[in-house]
Every structure is written in C-alpha cells, then in structure tokens.
Interface confidence: low
C-alpha cells in the first residue's frame, strides 16, 4: 500500500514500462485526452515495491485509487496510487481519502458544511479519470436518496456493475465509467489476454451475457491471431 | 488533439454586447467544467467565469458579474460567454479554459476591444 | 474574496536560480498551481498541486507550500525562461478561481 508521503516524482523514475514515458518531451497536449496522474501525491521509495496494476480503483485498498502514473498517460499502464489527502487536485471521489470527496476538483471533508445556495445539493462525483474522467473530471449529481438506490440506465454514471440496471455493466467510455449494454449474441468482445489489460481501453465493453462467452470469429481470418474478431458465442 | 477555439472577439463600442463562442474538440466537453480567463494589456491574467459540466452551476468574478453570462451547448461542444454592458476594462484577450490540472488545457485567444 | 500577491518583478542571470513568490492568507492549506505566459501565447501549466510538474516540464521547475507563502524555484535559468508566472488556486469557499497578479521574470 503506498502509504508514505515522500518524494513526488519517485514514480516517474520507474522502469519501464511503468515509468517509460513519464518524462517524454511533448506537447502540452496530449493525442489522449486527460489521463489521470498523481498530481499531489508523493510516493515511497522502497527497492523492492512493486507498483500494482489495476485496471479500475475497486481493485486497490482504501487508500489507493487506480490511474496512469503519467500525467499524459503515455504508459499506457495504469496502477494503484496513494489517494489524495484533503485540499488537493482531484478528478473523482475515489481518488480522495477515505473521509473525504471531491468537490470542484479539490478533495474535501465529507462532513465538510460550508455549502451555500445552489450548489448545497451538488457533489463532484467520479468519472473514470475525469474531474470525473481520463476523460475524467468532475460529474456533479443530485445528492438525494435516489443516487442510491436507483439503478442506473444506459449512459448513467457508476461505479461498479451493481450501480447499473439489469442488462447493463460498468464500464469505462474514455476515462469515465458508465453503465453499458451487457453484450448479446453475435456482437464484438474484447478477449483480454492477461489479467489487468482492460485498464488500458479507452471505450471498454461489457461482458458477454449469460451462457455466451468471448471467442474468435470461426470465419473471421486474419493474418495473425492477435488481430483476429472476437465475438460472443453460445458456449 | 485537444482543441479550444476561441471566436466572436472584435472592436466593440462600451454598452453594446459581444458573444464569444468556444469550440471543443478532442475530448468529452459534457464532461468538464469549463471556465473563462481574460488578460487585459498590461495586466495580469483574471478569471472570469466557471460553468459547470452540464450547465448546472455558474460563478462570476465580481467584475463582470451582472454583466456576462456564460452558458455552454453540450450537443455543439461548444462555451459561450454573453458579455452585455461592455466597459472600456473590458477590454482583454479572452481565454477559455479547463483549468482541471491533469487536464489543464487553453484555447489561444480570442482579443475583445471595447472603444468609442 | 481571497487575494495572491506576487512581487511585479524578479531578475535573474543566466545559469542561477530565480525564486518566485506567492502569498495569501494560509495559503499552505490550499493547492497552488503555477502558470507561465509569453507574449502571445496562452498560458502554460509548470507547476501543478504544490510542487508537482507535468511531464513536459523542465525538471529545473519546482515548487513549495507551507504557511502564507507559495514559491515557484527555477534553477539553471535559461533566457527561454524569460516571462510571465502566475500563481493560481481555487478558493473554494467563494466557487471562485483566483490568479496572483503575475511576476515578470527577467534574464539579465
């Protein structure tokens, strides 16, 4: 768990291809929009840490949230930072600590209650890697009991998969996740081929649906397996 | 390539109004908030407005509140500022911008001149 | 509404470091965010969250926090270095954005 408040660019210094492109010379703007990057966080030199990759924040501990270490996200590998501590830049909730959320782009105490006017009822609520995304930043939702209990339809913000509605998923569109169309017979899949690569989709599908499963198109020939079509296939 | 293009600025007498547009591409405008910044000849940079990804929420800088209006079209990708009761300090190069740190980007500029 | 004050202007010659200055009121519970501006071009983000630096960034920029005072550090300027810098946080308690008044940086 990267718990210590140290030096900030330890993990641009990492091997590649953790740190590979962490210091590329670029332009300010990059091809992909706004991956996220570790922003005020500081990192613990130990010889033998290990960066843990994940694909999506569920997947880190409670004081971890999952992004590119890179502000451009050129790695193209996305792995468990420490979370943001109160006052710092944020895109979404999950990368703050725990006890606090991210408002307007800065980590705030969830028992924080300065809120005025109009926005009293508002919350910065994650995207992907926004302020709420890599596209990610900052979705601000109606905070009622409706957020909580209401499954989210097609195109609802979430989470994880049980915030969707039956038939539908979490998953990423750019650096935001949202609920999606659980795949049905017959429509392209992506066939991970190691654990962790579906952190590196910008437009992530879903999964198969019950009784289907993700296998390359019997007809589909190309000239290497690599590129071959998956689809989903009665079992 | 993440894009922000300024456009609408031009010489304009003071008490007359201005609209300036800013077109987004590259990236998912409905996903960001999205602010304006001016710089005056001479002066320094100075924020101006603040409007939430999907138009719920909107701040002005005490110059100019009462004054401009800044709105957006998510289905345009597009931010406006509605400048009315133009004054002679308003005159500023125009910037929008995310201002979001990992995502910090700034159109070039569109010059707004408010002269008799 | 909160206020950065920033000194107009800070010389330096080439190859030395040149420290500029932000101070506002507890300004070390705030993030502070730097910008550089030359003539006609917009804005550049140098310095993110205290003292964090895009990876496009010079490692010869740096910043601190602490107190009433932010400070951006350029060591080994160069002449290309010459121009505007702006300190910038968000003042949450107004929604407001708030920019330093700029200091003009000068290589002798």
């Known amino acids: 768990t990267l718990n210590s408040v140290l030096n900030s660019n330890a993990i641009k210094n990492l091997p590649p291809p953790l740190g590979g492109a962490a210091g590329h010379p670029g332009s300010a703007v990059s091809a992909a929009p706004g991956i996220l990057y570790p922003g005020g966080n500081k990192y613990q030199t130990i010889d033998n840490y290990q960066p843990y990759p994940c694909a999506e924040d569920e997947e880190c501990g409670t004081d971890e949230y999952c992004a590119s270490p890179t502000r451009g996200g050129d790695a193209g590998v996305q792995i468990c930072l420490a979370c943001r501590k109160r006052r710092k830049r944020c895109m979404r909730h999950a990368m703050c600590c725990p006890g606090n959320y991210c408002k307007n782009g800065i980590c705030v105490s969830s028992d924080q209650n300065h809120f005025r006017g109009e926005i009293e009822e508002t919350i910065t609520e994650s995207f992907g890697n926004d302020h709420s995304t890599l596209d990610g930043y900052s979705r601000r939702t109606t905070l009622s009991s409706k957020m909580y209990h209401t499954k989210g339809q097609e195109g609802s913000v979430c989470l994880r998969s049980s915030d969707c509605a039956s038939g539908l998923c979490c998953a990423r569109h750019f650096w935001s996740k949202i609920c999606k169309p659980v795949l049905k017979e017959g429509q392209v899949c992506t066939k991970h081929r190691r654990k962790g690569s579906h952190g590196l989709e910008i437009f992530q599908r879903c999964y198969c649906g019950e009784g289907l499963s993700c296998r390359i198109q019997k007809d589909h020939h190309q000239a290497s397996n690599s590129s071959r079509l998956h689809t989903c296939q009665r079992h | 390539q993440v894009q922000l293009v300024e456009s609408g600025g031009g010489v304009v007498q003071p008490g007359r109004s201005l609209r300036l547009s800013c077109a987004a591409s590259?990236?998912?405008?409905?996903?960001?908030?999205m602010h304006w910044v001016r710089k005056a000849p001479g002066k320094g940079l100075e924020w101006v407005a603040i409007i939430f990804y999907d138009g719920s929420n909107k701040y002005y800088a005490d110059p100019v509140k009462g004054r401009f209006t800044i709105s957006r079209d998510n289905s345009k990708n597009t931010l406006y500022l509605q400048m009315n009761s133009l004054r002679a300090e308003d005159t500023a190069v125009y910037y929008c911008?995310?201002?979001?740190?990992?995502?910090?980007?700034w159109g070039q500029g569109t010059l707004v001149t408010v002269s008799s | 509404s909160y206020v950065l004050t920033q000194p107009p202007s800070v010389s330096v010659a080439p190859g030395q470091t040149a420290r500029i200055t932000c101070g506002g009121n507890n300004i070390g519970s705030k993030s502070v965010h730097w910008y550089q501006e030359k003539p006609g071009q917009a804005p550049v983000l140098v310095v993110y969250d205290d003292s964090d630096r895009p990876s496009e960034i010079p490692e010869r920029f740096s910043g601190s926090n602490s107190g009433n005072t932010a400070t951006l550090t350029i060591s080994r300027v160069e002449a290309g270095d010459e121009a505007d810098y702006y300190c910038?946080?968000?003042?949450?308690?107004?929604?407001?954005?708030?920019f330093g008044g700029g200091t003009r940086l000068t290589v002798l």
């Open positions: 910038q946080v968000w003042d949450s308690s107004s929604d407001h954005v708030v």
């Open positions: 590259g990236f998912t405008f409905s996903r960001y908030d």
């Open positions: 911008a995310t201002l979001a740190a990992a995502f910090d980007y």
